[in-house]
Interface confidence: low
């Protein structure tokens, strides 16, 4: 339905507070280097303008598109050229090219300082002094560091952030109350950002069809009692929501997400029996809850898939009449029967089925040709099952830190050209699959593990795309969305890699390592491990283990010494020499 003024429509739908929050997120995700105060000023100007349009939709400029209004506002930033370089050229373009240009300049790894958490009393004072500014600052800092963060979900995080401070700043032990909550929000926030980044990559790099296929599979697993028409409607609406958010249309996205939650709750009887609790919650909690809701029970006595998709004489006729609908129905029927499969596995099966029909429906005897198509699925199913079994056994044997180290070595040998910080970050996250998924029973391991790995490998892909250094990474990232993980798994040691020159400075440590948190100390050691492998890619596990054990002992010894700095200097030289000898450097 057309509105005279889009900005007035969204302001009225969303209300002033969410309007302002979403505009702030949008601006911070586009201009990631701009100071907070500049963004607040821009947001206030846009909000005042929106209010004039609410009062009179025919007022000057109120009929302009949101992209035009927001783009014009962003292009008033005086320091655009100095701060952003060629991004300033976007301002010479007309819509919709200008918005596309801004989107292309979003930076997944912006050069921003690490967020340091102040003392609890300092935070509580800031919260009480100016709650509104404090919460806006949270939105701004998260949005600029995570330019694809799902905006309506960030409002939910901000609400929980506010609740944590409201509760804990009046608690007897503020720190004991607040810090675990902030840790939880940080970890959940990083996971939420990474999951959304995969959705946006799916839409932007592989297109709407790829995203819709993913959504059909996931929603069919989650809502196995819903009929195909219902799932299709939800997929269409969900695709619109994510297309908007990934495209920077945050007001439309938030509004449409609210509409979708409303629709789901009004029609929960025909969707899922698990939605009742979610639908009793306020909007932000409701939308989050629906997105995370557990799979409904599978309907009893579902007929065999073979009848409709293999044995029927009408397979090719049905396929030819409406290919995507027929494949969608196949995916729906397969996914609702298999909550134990990962979404990417289901998509591989659907792709295999599609390829088989393309070939067989042109053959002399189509039925004879596709009769054994389900047999082709067996190795595709067994491959992730075996991989997960092996890796969970390794995780249980080693524990998370050493399991991460094993993956660090494995991935550095596969793609040694990738920067050390990226290899450390990605391998650490890959290693978290153990504690996240291996505790689950067999039936839940694969969807947990392989779909999580898809999210983590997408982080590698988007970071690598910014500075491409490895053809192998480019190949695995771009050839097939659903085969990324098998592609990386299949990579062997890169024999073409010329080992890095040895640099003693890389392995020089100082007393500051002693004051680091356990996590930061691990990262330091893991960084050294990656550098070791880059210097000596043919080093055996045993050699690397020996060097790392010596290194751990060295850090422990010097951190206990009276003169720590001298210990690090003297013992460090010995360690470097011993390591070089052990690795034959």
């Amino acid at each position: 339905d057309a509105h005279k003024s889009e900005v007035a429509h969204r302001f009225k739908d969303l209300g002033e507070e969410n309007f302002k929050a979403l505009v702030l997120i949008a601006f911070a995700q586009y201009l990631q280097q701009c100071p907070f105060e500049d963004h607040v000023k821009l947001v206030n100007e846009v909000t005042e303008f929106a209010k004039t349009c609410v009062a009179d939709e025919s007022a000057e400029n109120c009929d302009k598109s949101l992209h035009t209004l927001f783009g014009d506002k962003l292009c008033t930033v005086a320091t655009l050229r100095e701060t952003y370089g060629e991004m300033a050229d976007c301002c010479a373009k007309q819509e919709p090219e200008r918005n596309e240009c801004f989107l292309q300049h979003k930076d997944d790894n912006p050069n921003l300082p690490r967020l340091v958490r102040p003392e609890v009393d300092v935070m509580c004072t800031a919260f009480h002094d100016n709650e509104e500014t404090f919460l806006k600052k949270y939105l701004y800092e998260i949005a600029r560091r995570h330019p694809y963060f799902y905006a309506p979900e960030l409002l939910f995080f901000a609400k929980r952030y506010k609740a944590a401070f409201t509760e804990c700043c009046q608690a007897a032990d503020k720190a004991a109350c607040l810090l675990p909550k902030l840790d939880e929000l940080r970890d959940e926030g990083k996971a939420s950002s990474a999951k959304q980044r995969l959705k946006c990559a799916s839409l932007q790099k592989f297109g709407e069809r790829a995203f819709k296929a993913w959504a059909v599979a996931r929603l069919s697993q989650r809502f196995p009692k819903a009929e195909f028409a219902e799932v299709s409607k939800l997929v269409t609406d969900l695709t619109k929501v994510h297309t908007e958010c990934c495209h920077g249309d945050l007001l439309e996205c938030a509004d449409d997400r609210a509409d979708l939650a409303k629709y789901i709750c009004e029609n929960q009887d025909s969707i899922s029996s698990k939605l009742k609790e979610c639908c009793e919650k306020p909007l932000l909690e409701k939308s989050h809850c629906i997105a995370e809701v557990e799979n409904d029970e599978m309907p009893a006595d579902l007929p065999s898939l073979a009848a409709d998709f293999v044995e029927s004489k009408d397979v090719c006729k049905n396929y030819a009449e409406a290919k995507d609908v027929f494949l969608g129905m196949f995916l729906y029927e397969y996914a609702r029967r298999h909550p134990d499969y990962s979404v990417v596995l289901l998509l591989r099966l659907a792709k295999t089925y599609e390829t088989t029909l393309e070939k067989c429906c042109a053959a002399a005897d189509p039925h004879e040709c596709y009769a054994k198509v389900f047999d082709e699925f067996k190795p595709l199913v067994e491959e992730p099952q075996n991989l997960i079994k092996q890796n969970c056994e390794l995780f249980e044997q080693l524990g998370e830190y050493k399991f991460q180290n094993a993956l660090l070595v494995r991935y550095t040998k596969k793609v040694p050209q990738v920067s050390t910080p990226t290899l450390v970050e990605v391998s650490r996250n890959l290693g978290k699959v153990g504690s996240k998924c291996c505790k689950h029973p067999e039936a839940k391991r694969m969807p947990c593990a392989e779909d999580y790995l898809s999210v983590v490998l997408n982080q590698l892909c988007v970071l690598h795309e910014k500075t491409p250094v490895s053809d192998r990474v480019t190949k695995c990232c771009t050839e097939s969305l659903v085969n990324r993980r098998p592609c990386f798994s299949a990579l062997e040691v890169d024999e073409t890699y010329v080992p890095k020159e040895f640099n003693a400075e890389t392995f020089t440590f100082h007393a500051d390592i002693c004051t680091l948190s356990e996590k930061e100390r691990q990262i330091k050691k893991q960084t050294a491990l990656v550098e070791l492998v880059k210097h000596k890619p043919k080093a055996t596990k045993e050699q690397l283990k020996a060097v790392m054990d010596d290194f751990a002992a060295f850090v422990e010894k010097c951190c206990k010494a009276d003169d720590k700095e001298t210990c690090f200097a003297e013992e460090g030289k010995k360690l470097v020499a011993a390591s070089q000898a052990a690795l034959g450097l």
Epitope: H9, F11, K12, D13, L14, G15, E16, E17, N18, F19, V54, L155, K159, A258, D259, K262, P282, L283, L284, K286
Partner: nanobody
Framework: EVQLVESGGGLVKPGGSLRLSCAAS????????MNWVRQAPGKGLEWVSS????????YYADSVKGRFTISRDNAKNSLYLQMNSLRAEDTAVYYC???????????????WGQGTLVTVSS
């Protein structure tokens, strides 16, 4: 000064209907989400229904879904609750309340009316 004044309560038989009104003043009504909340005798507060600033988003508690209808007239600065098929358990003081956040359904309302009593009894 923000003011919310409810009216329309009274005694009604089970199965009967009532229409509550809430007249708002002292703020830009059309910019705020509005809510109905009730309190049964001796019980805690129970959220009943929410309506977004433009009236496009509407939510109901399960206990009233299909029987109550929330609406608003921004030109008249008024909020309404049409209550049909009333039951004894709907007996309560009904309050209209403003959402300070103008959105988000936080349910921590900043302004409340004085309430209007609805009694459902034969």
């Amino acid at each position: 000064e923000v003011q919310l004044v409810e009216s329309g309560g009274g005694l009604v038989k089970p199965g009967g209907s009532l229409r509550l009104s809430c007249a708002a003043s002292g703020f830009t009504f059309s910019n705020y989400n509005m809510n109905w909340v009730r309190q049964a005798p001796g019980k805690g507060l129970e959220w009943v229904s929410s309506i977004s600033s433009a009236g496009t988003h509407i939510y109901y508690a399960d206990s009233v879904k299909g029987r109550f209808t929330i609406s608003r007239d921004n030109a008249k600065n008024s909020l309404y609750l049409q209550m049909n098929s009333l039951r004894a358990e709907d007996t309560a003081v009904y309050y209209c309340a403003r959402d300070p956040h103008s959105t988000g359904w936080y349910k921590d309302f900043d302004y409340w009316g004085q309430g209007t009593l609805v009694t459902v009894s034969s």
